[in-house]
């Protein structure tokens, strides 16, 4: 049978001779050279050679365990004379013994990591890993220990795991953001003579909201003309925040000051500025300077940093309102005046008042816009604003006069303003009532006494406060011996009635009745109107057949058939 132990061979042999591996030996070998040893398998005849007589095996080349740790070969022993095997072909192993010839190598040449600023000591940052190609099962050649070469006192590394942690309290991004840490991995458990490799870890502190906004100045001053309409931007303020991104976002608000209602602040997210704008119309004459307290605050706060103080800052904004030469201002937006229609020329109706609102209080002159009073019915005292008539009025022609008065600064004619005047002409009883229409009626020859032949109505251009009250009567010259009577109905109408039985159209074909109509106002106005009554022949139904004069076309009045 074969007689050998497992073969071991030290890697990376540097001697000048071949490296002795071991001896193949059969117990059948008497040492007389009758046996021949043959080697086959991994590297046989090349890497490994055998003395066919003695069975001694040698390695011809320098071997690297990390390239190939085990070689599997086959051994044969044959009788030289017969060529027959004296031992069964057998497999054997040459195991390459490790030496510490490889340094640890990190999985990355450069690591990149982030950790929030102000993190607690011991906060995980990143884990680095180094591998060693040497045999981990034998000795400490592959036992890697990590240490920090650069980056203390800020960071530490766990020697066995390669976990990098923060090592210093209150690391402030605003003070320093980037750190370059160098980590060493050393084999042999870190002992002397161990091989080592290094890697660089670039660590960036990420931002947390640990800084409040701060105004670079405590007071800002802006100017704006009093004429600035609402929405006009007056100026911009900007607080700075040492943080970045969301943590540096700022919102502005007006928290106090007498300008609280007069101004707005709008946060512009693009620039993180506060834009002060006009909110309500300003008036230099009322208030020349406003003071606002403006606050800048972080909308995103981290509760754990609230102990550092409020995440807000205040500044005072002083707004100076600049005077603008303004036109005169009337005491009213519109004036309503009244005057009787019987007013004499140069009668004063009323007055308007306008003042220069500016501090200068420039004197004002008044005038009527003639485009609104083409007939020059009215005039104005340029000095005191009194309105008076320059022509006679007639309410029945025009009830309302709408005119415009202009107030102009004497020292600066460009500054003027206008106001509407509505002048109502009040009624005076200066018109007599008159018939509502021309009355021409007829009476049948066979008419009976007290028969209604016509109803009269009157109109009056006047407009008395308590309404019209007309009275009707026959004119005195016709009252006695008249063939007709007037019956006043007391409702502003009257009726003409026959006074006798029967009329003869051959005796009298036409009657002219003078009717007096009076109103009941002061002074009383009256007029006389004439009613023409024709006598006609009628049928037995009372329908007119013929009259002495030409036939009546569409006669007014009531049928006399009744």
């Amino acid at each position: 049978s074969w007689m050998w132990n497992q073969f071991f061979l030290l890697e990376e042999y540097t001697g000048s001779d071949y490296q002795y591996v071991g001896k193949l030996h059969s117990d059948q070998d008497r040492g007389d050279g009758s046996l021949k040893y043959i080697l086959s398998g991994d590297g046989a005849g090349d890497l490994f050679i055998i003395n066919e007589n003695t069975g001694d095996i040698q390695a011809t080349k320098r071997l690297d365990r990390e390239e190939k740790p085990v070689y599997i070969l086959r051994a044969q022993a044959i009788n030289r004379r017969t060529g027959r095997p004296v031992e069964p072909e057998s497999e054997f192993i040459i195991k390459i013994h490790d030496i510490n010839d490889n340094e640890p190598i990190f999985t990355k040449e450069v690591y990149t990591a982030t950790v929030p600023e102000m993190s607690d000591v011991g906060t995980f940052v990143v884990q680095v890993t180094a591998t060693d190609a040497d045999d981990p099962t034998y000795g400490n050649s592959a036992k890697v220990v990590y240490s920090i070469l650069q980056g203390q006192p800020y960071f530490s590394v766990e020697s066995e795991t390669g976990i990098i942690k923060t090592a210093l309290l209150n690391m402030d991004r605003e003070n320093r953001e980037q750190y370059q840490v160098v980590i060493q991995a050393k084999d042999m458990g870190g002992q002397m003579g161990g091989l080592s490799g290094t890697t660089t870890v670039n660590i960036t502190l990420t931002d947390v909201n640990d800084n409040p906004p701060r105004f670079p100045q405590s007071t800002y001053q802006f100017k704006t003309p009093e004429s600035s309409p609402p929405g006009t931007p007056i100026g911009r303020i900007k607080a700075s925040d040492a943080d970045v991104g969301e943590n540096a976002e700022i919102e502005y608000s007006i928290t106090d000051g007498e300008g609280l209602d007069m101004f707005d602040v709008i946060t512009d997210q693009e620039t993180q500025e506060g834009i002060i704008t006009v909110k309500k119309l300003l008036d230099f004459e009322k208030k020349k300077v406003y003071t606002l307290k403006v606050e800048a605050s972080n909308p995103h706060v981290e509760p754990r940093f609230l102990y550092l103080g409020p995440f807000k800052d205040s500044a005072t904004v002083r707004i100076v309102v600049e005077d603008v030469d303004e036109p005169p201002v009337f005491s009213k937006l519109a004036y309503i005046l009244q005057i009787r229609e019987d007013a004499q020329i140069n009668t004063t109706i009323g007055s308007v008042t306008a003042q220069d609102p500016d501090a200068a209080r420039n004197p004002v002159k008044y005038s009527v816009d003639r485009h609104t009073d083409m007939d020059r019915i009215f005039n104005i005292d340029s000095g005191n604003g009194s309105i008076f008539t320059s022509k006679l009025l007639d309410r029945e022609t025009l009830l309302w006069h709408n005119i415009t008065v202009i107030a102009t600064e004497i020292n600066n004619p460009k500054q003027s303003s206008r106001v509407p005047l509505y002048i109502k002409v009040l009624d005076v009883n200066d018109n007599a009532p008159e018939f509502a229409e021309f009355y021409e009626t007829f009476v049948c020859e066979k008419a009976k006494a007290d028969q209604l032949i016509q109803t009269l109505r009157a109109v009056d251009k006047d407009d008395p406060y308590s309404g019209h009250q007309f009275s009707f009567s026959l004119a005195p010259e016709a009252a006695s011996g008249s063939n007709f009577t007037i019956q006043d109905n007391k409702d502003n109408t009257a009726g003409i009635l026959t006074r006798k039985n029967g009329y003869n159209r051959h005796e009298m074909s036409t009657y002219l009745l003078p009717v007096v109509i009076s109103d009941n106002d002061y002074p009383v106005q009256s007029s006389t109107g004439t009613v023409t009554v024709r006598v006609c022949a009628c049928d037995h139904h009372g329908n007119m057949q013929s009259c002495h004069a030409e036939a009546l076309i569409h006669p007014t009045g009531l049928s006399t058939g009744a």
Partner: antibody, heavy 118, light 109 residues
Framework: QVQLVESGGGLVKPGGSLRLSCAAS????????MDWVRQAPGKGLEWVGR??????????DYAAPVKGRFTISRDDSKNTLYLQMNSLKTEDTAVYYC?????????WGQGTLVTVSS | DIELTQPPSVSVSPGQTASITCSGD??????AQWYQQKPGQAPVLVIY???ERPSGIPERFSGSNSGNTATLTISGTQAEDEADYYC???????????FGGGTKLTVLG
């Protein structure tokens, strides 16, 4: 980095509808006012409308030519701006841009083409 | 609402100063902004708050605003400045955003 990307453009018949989207990234979308601006072929920029941030009431404003037909909305949880376009007319043909800003438009998308044609 | 009027085109030789105006009623009491747009691209803000320049915008771009006119000035104009320029105003109250009609800047040569 800060980015706006429009999508949803295409060919649509007059009277039809289309919904454009604008995906925002790289900034706190919810805090910003967002606008839609369009540009007809060979013409100038025309403002379409805006939606303010929720902090400013989420108010929408529109240009006269699109009022009553277009609706702007936002989904802050998805960082997305929308433009719903109804009753489309041929004169609505344009490249539609979404843009960020209040006083000025500092960030613009690349635009999406909407063609309204029969 | 305010109407903003721009000249349709402005030409300038390389190295010279180009001025583009934007007229509008009392625009000086509002904030004016300017956008640059090159063919096939989205607009880019070049001036905001009348005269502020965003980061990345060359110093040759400047702005002013007073009275009824806002002005964009490009000093030492370069070929790459050839583009359309639009003004826009903001007044804090107006609910609508208004753009000018745009000005085509041509750099000669």
């Amino acid at each position: 980095q800060v980015q706006l990307v429009e999508s949803g453009g295409g060919l649509v018949k007059p009277g039809g509808s289309l919904r454009l989207s604008c995906a925002a990234s790289g900034f706190t979308f919810s805090r910003y006012w967002m606008d839609w601006v369009r540009q007809a072929p060979g013409k100038g920029l025309e403002w379409v409308g805006r939606i303010k941030s929720k902090a400013n009431g989420g108010i929408t404003d529109y240009a006269a030519p699109v009022k009553g037909r277009f609706t702007i909305s936002r989904d802050d949880s998805k960082n997305t701006l929308y433009l719903q376009m109804n009753s489309l007319k041929t004169e609505d043909t344009a490249v539609y841009y979404c843009a960020r800003g209040m006083t000025f438009l500092g960030i613009w998308g690349q635009g999406t083409l909407v063609t309204v044609s029969s | 609402d305010i109407e903003l009027t721009q000249p349709p085109s402005v030409s300038v030789s390389p190295g010279q100063t180009a001025s583009i105006t934007c007229s509008g009623d009392s625009i000086g009491s509002k904030y004016a902004q300017w956008y640059q747009q090159k063919p096939g691209q989205a607009p880019v803000l070049v001036i905001y708050y009348n005269s502020e320049r965003p980061s990345g915008i060359p110093e040759r771009f400047s702005g002013s605003n007073s009275g009824n006119t806002a002005t964009l000035t490009i000093s030492g104009t370069q070929a790459e400045d050839e583009a359309d320029y639009y003004c826009q105003s903001w007044d804090g109250q107006s609910t609508i955003r208004v753009f000018g009609g745009g000005t085509k800047l041509t750099v000669l040569g």
